[in-house]
Amino acid sequence: MAKAAAIGIDLGTTYSCVGVFQHGKVEIIANDQGNRTTPSYVAFTDTERLIGDAAKNQVALNPQNTVFDAKRLIGRKFGDPVVQSDMKHWPFQVINDGDKPKVQVSYKGETKAFYPEEISSMVLTKMKEIAEAYLGYPVTNAVITVPAYFNDSQRQATKDAGVIAGLNVLRIINEPTAAAIAYGLDRTGKGERNVLIFDLGGGTFDVSILTIDDGIFEVKATAGDTHLGGEDFDNRLVNHFVEEFKRKHKKDISQNKRAVRRLRTACERAKRTLSSSTQASLEIDSLFEGIDFYTSITRARFEELCSDLFRSTLEPVEKALRDAKLDKAQIHDLVLVGGSTRIPKVQKLLQDFFNGRDLNKSINPDEAVAYGAAVQAAILMGDKSENVQDLLLLDVAPLSLGLETAGGVMTALIKRNSTIPTKQTQIFTTYSDNQPGVLIQVYEGERAMTKDNNLLGRFELSGIPPAPRGVPQIEVTFDIDANGILNVTATDKSTGKANKITITNDKGRLSKEEIERMVQEAEKYKAEDEVQRERVSAKNALESYAFNMKSAVEDEGLKGKISEADKKKVLDKCQEVISWLDANTLAEKDEFEHKRKELEQVCNPIISGLYQGAGGPGPGGFGAQGPKGGSGSGPTIEEVD
């Protein structure tokens, strides 16, 4: 019998992840809830101990006895200023036991106190069990990751947690190192490489600069913010919707813990949606005093709410570069880690900072660390197997295949039931003036809006030369071969620059039954979808345009290029539109479009004036493919009429 595999565990502050290398590839293992990451939460009740999703799901009902953030305590003294500061924000109690912090909870009617190592060991036990359920045999060997800045006592305490969980800890490795291994950056054979790892997780933000030379990793610098992450973005959304609820229903839900917790859960879900769609809906039944809260938010609004937080991520990048005594041009590779790096605005800020450099993001960012840990675990166990390719075999395309165009619209290139192999090409264009790239998001499904369909994958085509919106021609080709492997290619016809994605496996795809159900539902919803799609698209277009214009004229780079009078004119009109939007989220398509055109009438002449002589659009510079709605936030692609 083949020897038991070793696992890689990313023990995170808010979420943990486990992977295994077998049959020549890494498999990130889903838990019993089907989630590939598991909350680093442990809850104690009158009857049982809960770990992971079950613990997080009941936190609103049992906050004092639900423990999280153990990673902020592990290996630290009680008197550590970090511990003293963090304690103020936790609903559970932390006590002092010989200058060691312990978490005190009520469990099965008794008061119990646990060391951080014990809490972490419970999470590690859960991760071990997840792996065992998948592999079908006991697992003992593991590689566990820690932040690069962890000191020896924090590393030892993490190892102890592994031992308590019944694991043989093969090695404790740095999270950024694991991420670099995941991308094979240690195997490029190109001499010394400087790698910047940008890790924006649920609760922490870490920037690390590594030098890799002949398989040797050296940490050159670390920086970050131990209290910046996805939860902060959730908080901004929560505050936004608390205010919206006040406006709409004249009621303040902020003191109702259960309502806020339910809102927070919906906000976290909406935030995730906004990384792949330009709009997200929240539907919370009976949120407060029997009132159903149905609302939505656009990506542009979310970006505005979090703009200062997003921008602040660049400060640690600059600090790490200074500390490493490197110029940004000397960085060879940029690696994205942590779920929050899925946020398009975060990616754009980082990419712009590095002058358009490509980002390593093909591996799921909240799985990259566990991925690398799994590879390292296999190496330490002496695995030398070859990689094996997954293939998807079909004879017809069971669902329409297409991409998202402006406003979250599904534009199908290959229709359902097309026989394969088949190849379809269509021309698309940009939504915004001087848009530097387009995000190609590939979906399958029959619904009018991509949010109701299934995301298969995404990639970006960058480096589009500055041009008025509607002018660039992006040729997109969907090609399914005889094996059912889908290749999607996007080419900028002006430069010949191309990028592609290959979708080869059926993970995340839908079953026959689901497909049938979706097809039937789509028929039923088609008419109402269409009206809603157009309305949402118009609302998106307006909101995104307003925020984009607002941020455009507030850009420091425009100082001296735009008169104060023009700036005021644009900002006043943007304020008018944004406030109107807040009060009229359910307005009709015509009203949104009218407001957008009004705003464009004010902004376009002013903005275009800035680009005159710089190859920018002059009046009427939109051509026949002029503005047609959709969202201008991020690299949006638009269908050409």
Epitope: D572, Q575, E576, I578, S579, W580, D582, A583, N584, A587, D590, E591, H594, K595, K597, E598, E600, Q601, N604, P605, S608, P619, G620, F622, G626, P627
Partner: antibody, heavy 116, light 112 residues
């Protein structure tokens, strides 16, 4: 000074088409929207819609969707209102009006009479 | 669609007296962000094009005599002519620009 000068009165038969022009001067044409307003004999003002002179995108009020078309020619700073399939109840004075939060300058109006 | 209802339909006032015209909107015209009400008043003399008098409820267009004033908020608005002059004989229209645009039905002001 700012002026909007409209084309002269028209008499048309039912089913015919008419094109009313509105030539702007004294300001940058593409910086301001152009509205169209109808006033039937002895009646009040009816907002027909407007055109974004920068992008050329029109907006039509519900009652004016279908037979009406707004266009511009930025090279001559002129806005146009096209009306096809004329009916007797289209008899009215048609005004163009510059827009900047409010309709601050108006054309003199063009009387279109539809009669068999 | 927002409906504006003007009252009265017509009004006869003696020279030098005050004329008051009301305009009621089917929904609020107040933008809470800008704290402005998007309502304007226009004057149309016989055989002429309309002329802008007041915008944002109470801001007089330049060149408009100060006997014309506007007030109100939300859904109820008033145009007041403090001391009616002969040249003020006209039809007065309110117009909203909160969402799309609509005119009120007009109020005819005559001399008593």
């Amino acid at each position: 000074q700012i002026q909007l000068v409209q084309s002269g009165a028209e008499v048309k038969k039912p089913g015919a088409s008419v094109k009313v022009s509105c030539k702007a001067s004294g300001y940058t044409f593409t910086n301001y929207g152009m509205n169209w307003v109808r006033q039937a004999p002895g009646q009040g003002l009816e907002w027909m819609g407007w055109i974004n002179t920068y992008t050329g995108e029109p907006t039509y009020a519900d009652d004016f969707k279908g037979r009406f078309t707004f266009t511009t020619d930025t090279s001559t700073s002129t806005a146009y209102m096209d009306l096809r399939s004329l009916r007797s109840d289209d008899t009215a004075v048609y005004f163009c009006a510059r827009y900047d939060h409010y309709m601050d300058y108006w054309g003199q109006g063009t009387l279109v009479t539809v009669s068999s | 669609e927002i409906v504006l209802t003007q009252s009265p339909d017509s009004l006869a006032v003696s020279l030098g007296e005050r004329a008051t015209i009301n305009c009621k909107s089917s929904q609020s015209l107040l933008n809470s962000g800008t704290r402005k009400n998007y309502l304007a008043w226009y004057q149309q003399k016989p055989g002429q094009s309309p002329k802008l008098l007041i915008y944002w409820t109470s801001t007089r267009e330049s060149g408009v005599p100060d006997r014309f004033s506007g007030s109100g908020s939300g859904t109820d608005f008033t145009l007041t002519i403090d001391s009616l002059q002969a040249e003020d004989v006209a039809v007065y229209y309110c117009k909203q620009s909160y969402t799309l645009y609509t005119f009120g039905g007009g109020t005819k002001v005559e001399i008593k």
